[in-house]
């Protein structure tokens, strides 16, 4: 992939001077999935006409992926084997492990509004537990 940077830690920021941030981020909220399975992380930005210049997907302070308006997708090298871009601006996590449990963030960098951030909490369950219907309620 053409991205030419040695380290991808951290998150992003762009935005809009003086404009009101009218948009809202809708996410899948709290979700659970089986160990070994896959899950789609989705955020949707609505109620704004701002131009999306980049979307960053982060797990805590680790950058998973970037979707840039000019350059398309970049998946961080350490996640290449288990992260797939899409659908849309979402992200698919594969071969899930219990260590994947935690908070995930989508950061929509827009002009002129600024940065909109959405939060998703993922719990990866042992398959037997997941089969018995232990699920978080999506708010």
């Amino acid at each position: 992939y053409p991205y030419d940077v040695p380290d991808y830690a951290g998150g992003g920021g762009s935005g809009g001077g003086g404009s009101m941030m009218t948009g809202t981020i809708e996410t899948t909220g709290n979700i659970s999935a089986e160990k070994g399975g896959s899950i789609i992380l989705q955020c949707h930005l609505s109620s704004t006409t701002a131009q999306v210049t980049q979307v960053n997907w982060e797990q805590q302070d680790q950058l998973l992926a970037i979707c840039n308006a000019d350059l398309g997708w970049h998946i961080s090298p350490s996640f290449k084997d288990r992260v797939a871009p899409g659908p849309g601006l979402g992200l698919t996590l594969q071969s899930l492990t219990v260590n994947d449990t935690g908070e995930y963030f989508c950061a929509y960098h827009t002009y002129p509004d600024g940065t909109y951030t959405g939060r998703i909490f993922l719990e990866v369950l042992e398959s037997s537990v997941a089969e018995h219907g232990a699920r978080f309620q999506i708010p």
Epitope: D4, Y8, G12, G13, G16, L63, A69
Partner: antibody, heavy 119, light 107 residues
Framework: EVQLVESGGGLVQPGGSLRLSCAAS????????MHWVRQAPGKGLEWVAF????????YYADTVKGRFTISRDNAKNSLYLQMNSLRAEDTAVYYC????????????WGQGTMVTVSS | DIQMTQSPSSLSASVGDRVTITCRAS??????LAWYQQKPGKAPKLLIY???TLQSGVPSRFSGSGSGTDFTLTISSLQPEDFATYYC?????????FGGGTKVEIK
Amino acid sequence: EVQLVESGGGLVQPGGSLRLSCAASGFTFSNFGMHWVRQAPGKGLEWVAFISSGSSSIYYADTVKGRFTISRDNAKNSLYLQMNSLRAEDTAVYYCARMRLDYYAMDYWGQGTMVTVSS
Amino acid sequence: DIQMTQSPSSLSASVGDRVTITCRASKSISKYLAWYQQKPGKAPKLLIYSGSTLQSGVPSRFSGSGSGTDFTLTISSLQPEDFATYYCQQHNEYPWTFGGGTKVEIK
């Protein structure tokens, strides 16, 4: 090694024009957004303009909007700033700076070129 | 525009001292703050981005913290090469704006 070299500065009269250039080397220029930032003598830093890697996003500070034009030629690894209707308050060192890929801060800067607007 | 206020505007310190510089944004910028070092006649150098992430090649004596409106740059043990002016910059919103700078001088 990442290198950014500005040129084109000089003395110009109020109302005049100047075109600054920034020659980039040591990285894949076409993958990076680029900024112009200026610094008036003895003062702090002021962001001037930004252009994304493929030129689809171009933004200006209000102080230069309508007078300055940022552009780039990825085939020539070059960034430009066309400055028209120059004013005394535009006197500054002008830096080109590369934007980090993962977010919009400036990770490499050129040495700067001095622009003096005076009659 | 978001105003960035740095304090102090200047300070005197000795080699080995722990130095703290603060930066306050006029509204929340989440974690999106960068710190730069500038020496006389030279271009700024990126030290910290995204509030607390150390730029590659920057010594570990530099650290950043904070989120929302209040941020701190700390130099744990000041070295001779650290005497310079330090600027904060928000990268959450256009236009990107810088603090007024903090000059760190030799005591």
